[in-house]
Interface confidence: medium
């Protein structure tokens, strides 16, 4: 029978270099009799016997952890006793050696010109990885905008567009070495205007084209704004090139504008916005059409169609690039300003308004139009639409509504042949005749001038009933 | 670039109707005139109908009068025809085509390329 | 009811020059009926080639002109080339109680 002998570790516990995820085993080999009870602990913490990470077998002498975690590197100790003597003990450490990680990688980042930008770059690894820096294709440098920091991270002070591109981390130790994806470092640009819009003078009906450039990153967009509200006409072409945007804003000019160019991009929730205006005034639009060169034809329109002759040939000014066509939006744009005027001035000023702009014609060689008569003209403003004209004049002279006037195409009266110098030089308006035959009385009028301004409509044309300061009997 | 695309054209029946569409782009539309025309097939050009800018006159051949309706949705940059009470003699490929200007009968300048319509029993 | 007219069918030599004409069955062409010039080739959608008697729509080679002769409207190619075979239509505006835009019947121009 053999005697009892107290136990002895004839294999000391080594030191475990481990990689994580492998297997890691210690062996504690122990002689003594009775057989010992081997215990084990890491950390002196008690290795319980039913955790499934461990395998111990060969009696206990052979401890294995079947799947290295980072967590489990550490002091390892087997104790062996069989209750002669005292119990023996046997440590090593277990290093868990790992393979470069990167546990919080950079992504991709968009930043304003001028502020500083971080990618962050977390690393884990035993030995500890050094991290470096790729962008594009090439090692990164640093210099004295550009560092990676104690934790791996990149950080860059005053960011330029140069900066813009695709970076990727690199973590290395001896193990091995790992890359992080490619991310996109955007540098964005505060929109900025190059080139302003210019102002101009033009006359009625012409086109303008308004040019607007501007850079920025993202490319911005541009708008445009027509005294404070968004452009209700026109055509706007736009192209891109090289992060410059040039729009091109072309009116048909019908009334003056303040036209603003607003070049906008958007930074994350945030916008840039950059503004530039510029203004376009009408030169006078009444100008003597004694000198207008043009041609006779038919009125092939919608607006005049009710009030003129239905075959009759009018003047067409080929100072517009497309007189039918200015003409025409003229005649609508003056409309509309009729719309509010009372229901005795619309009729009265539709027809010499109609008459004024498509004025009849007698082809000849030189195509010449015919004035409305002076006599018809006065009716209209003295008459039927006494008020409207007064306020439109007083709106005038208060700088109220320069434009209004010079957009309405209302003739100067007193600039008009008189009927009764040569009833074949001028226009008579059929509508005011016919008002003869349907109106008896007016009301009262003050005029602002005296009635002798008003030479009397013939009586063989028309005996307006009136009050007596218009007796044009 | 000046677009036109017609659509909505197909068989239908004598007396049966259809919604002839044109879609507009690359111009401002509501700044001009609009236009339907008919070929025939193996025959030559025939107006149908206009409209100004604003939409605000139509105008009609003596022969379609009463049961052809144009319109327009500027918002839309789109044209109409509305071709009701249809007859064997309408069939043809219906243009949309673009005026010149504001006014419903400018020059045609631009053209789409056509819709079929079929009138048949 | 206004009737256009246009010959039916026109040939040319090519480099020739040739005049197409286009008339109204009651009347003279004038330039209140704004004479339109509109060419066709087979399969295709018609294209603007002059407008209001005179103005060359854009791209159109100068080559093609239009005036009034006499009592018609005309459309003249001068330097007559083979892609210039085709359907050529005139339009015209007319006022006949109502507003009415008119097409001619249409000229078949072969380039030989």
């Known amino acids: 029978e053999k005697l009892p002998k107290a136990p002895v570790i004839t294999t000391p516990l080594e030191t475990v270099d481990a990689l994580v995820e492998e297997v890691a085993t210690f062996m504690c080999a122990v002689e003594s009799y009775p057989q010992p009870e081997i215990s084990w602990t890491r950390n002196k913490i008690l290795i319980k016997l039913f955790d499934t990470r461990y395998s111990i077998r060969e009696n206990g002498q052979l401890l294995t952890i079947l799947s290295v975690e980072d967590s489990d590197d550490g002091i390892y100790c087997c104790i062996a006793n069989n209750g002669v003597g005292g119990a023996v003990e046997s440590c090593g450490a277990l290093q868990v050696k790992m393979k470069p990680k990167i546990t919080r990688p950079p992504i991709n980042v968009k930043i304003i010109e001028g502020l500083k930008a971080v990618l962050p770059c977390t690393t884990m690894g035993n030995p500890k990885p050094s991290v470096s820096w790729i962008k594009g294709d090439n090692a990164l440098r640093e210099n004295s905008r550009i560092a990676v920091l104690e934790s791996g991270s990149l950080r860059i002070h005053n960011v330029q567009k140069e900066d813009a591109g695709q970076y990727r981390c690199v973590a290395k130790n001896s193990l091995g070495t790992a890359y992080s994806k490619l991310v996109k470092l955007e540098v964005e640009v505060f929109a900025r205007i190059l080139r302003a819009p210019e102002s101009h003078n033009v006359t009625f009906g012409s086109f303008v084209t308004l040019r607007c450039t501007a850079i920025g990153i993202p490319v911005p967009t541009i708008s445009w704004i027509e005294n404070g509200n968004a452009v209700s006409s026109g055509s706007i072409q736009e192209s891109v090139k090289d992060r410059v945007i040039d729009s091109r804003l072309q009116l048909f000019i019908t009334k003056p504008g303040l036209y603003t160019c607003i070049a906008t991009n958007k930074h994350g929730e945030k916008f840039s916005t950059a503004k530039a205006a510029a203004t376009v005034s009408i030169a006078e639009w009444s100008k003597s059409q004694k000198d207008s060169q043009g041609y006779c034809a038919q009125y092939r329109g919608e607006v005049c169609d009710a009030v003129l002759a239905k075959d009759a040939l009018v003047f067409f000014n080929t100072s517009y690039r497309d007189p039918e066509d200015a003409q025409e939006l003229l005649i609508h744009t003056a409309w509309n300003e009729l719309k509010a005027v009372s229901p005795l001035c619309r009729p009265a000023a539709e027809a010499l308004l109609c008459n004024h702009l498509f004025q009849e014609c007698s082809p000849g060689v030189v195509p010449t139009p015919m004035p409305i008569c002076r006599e018809y003209c006065l009716a209209v403003k003295e008459l039927f639409c006494a008020k409207e004209w007064q306020a439109m004049e007083g709106k005038a002279h208060r700088g109220l509504y320069r434009s209004g006037m010079h957009l309405l195409p209302v003739p100067e009266c007193s600039k008009l042949p008189s009927m009764h110098r040569d009833p074949t030089a001028c226009t008579r308006l059929p509508y005011l005749d016919y008002k003869k035959e349907n109106i008896t009385t007016f009301p009262s009028i003050t005029s602002s001038r005296p009635s002798a301004d008003i030479p009397n409509l013939p009586a063989s044309t028309s005996s307006f009933a009136v009050s007596p300061a218009y007796s044009m009997t | 670039e000046v677009q036109l695309l017609e659509s909505g054209g197909g068989l239908v029946q004598p007396g049966g109707s259809l919604r002839l569409s044109c879609a507009a782009s690359?111009?401002?539309?509501?700044?001009?005139?609009m236009s339907w025309v008919r070929q025939a097939p193996g025959k030559g050009l025939e107006w149908v109908s206009a409209?100004?800018?604003?939409?605000?006159?139509?105008y009609y051949k003596e022969s379609v009068k009463g049961r052809f309706t144009i319109s327009r949705d500027n918002s839309k940059n789109t044209l109409y025809l509305q071709m009701n009470s249809l007859r064997a003699e309408d069939t043809a490929v219906y243009y949309c085509?673009?005026?010149?200007?504001?006014?419903?009968?400018?020059?045609?300048?631009?053209w789409g390329q056509g819709t079929l319509v079929t009138v048949s029993s | 009811q206004t009737v256009v007219t246009q010959e039916p069918s026109f040939s040319v030599s090519p480099g020739g020059t040739v005049t197409l004409t286009c008339g109204l069955s009651?009347?003279?062409?004038?330039?209140?009926?704004?004479p339109d010039w509109y060419q066709q080739t087979p399969g295709q959608a018609p294209r603007t080639l002059i407008y209001?008697?005179?103005s060359r729509h854009s791209g159109v080679p100068d080559r093609f002109s239009g005036s009034i002769l006499g009592n018609k409207a005309a459309l003249t190619i001068t330097g007559a080339q083979a892609d210039d075979e085709s359907d050529y239509y005139c339009?015209?505006?007319?006022?006949?109680?109502?507003?009415?835009?008119?097409f001619g019947g249409g000229t078949k121009l072969t380039v030989l």
């Open positions: 339009g015209l505006y007319s006022y006949s109680g109502s507003k009415n835009y008119v």
């Open positions: 009651s009347g003279s062409v004038t330039s209140s009926n704004y």
């Open positions: 209001s008697t005179d």
């Open positions: 409209i100004p800018w604003q939409g605000g006159s139509t």
């Open positions: 085509a673009k005026r010149s200007g504001r006014i419903a009968f400018g020059a045609l300048d631009a």
């Open positions: 690359g111009f401002t539309f509501s700044d001009y005139g």
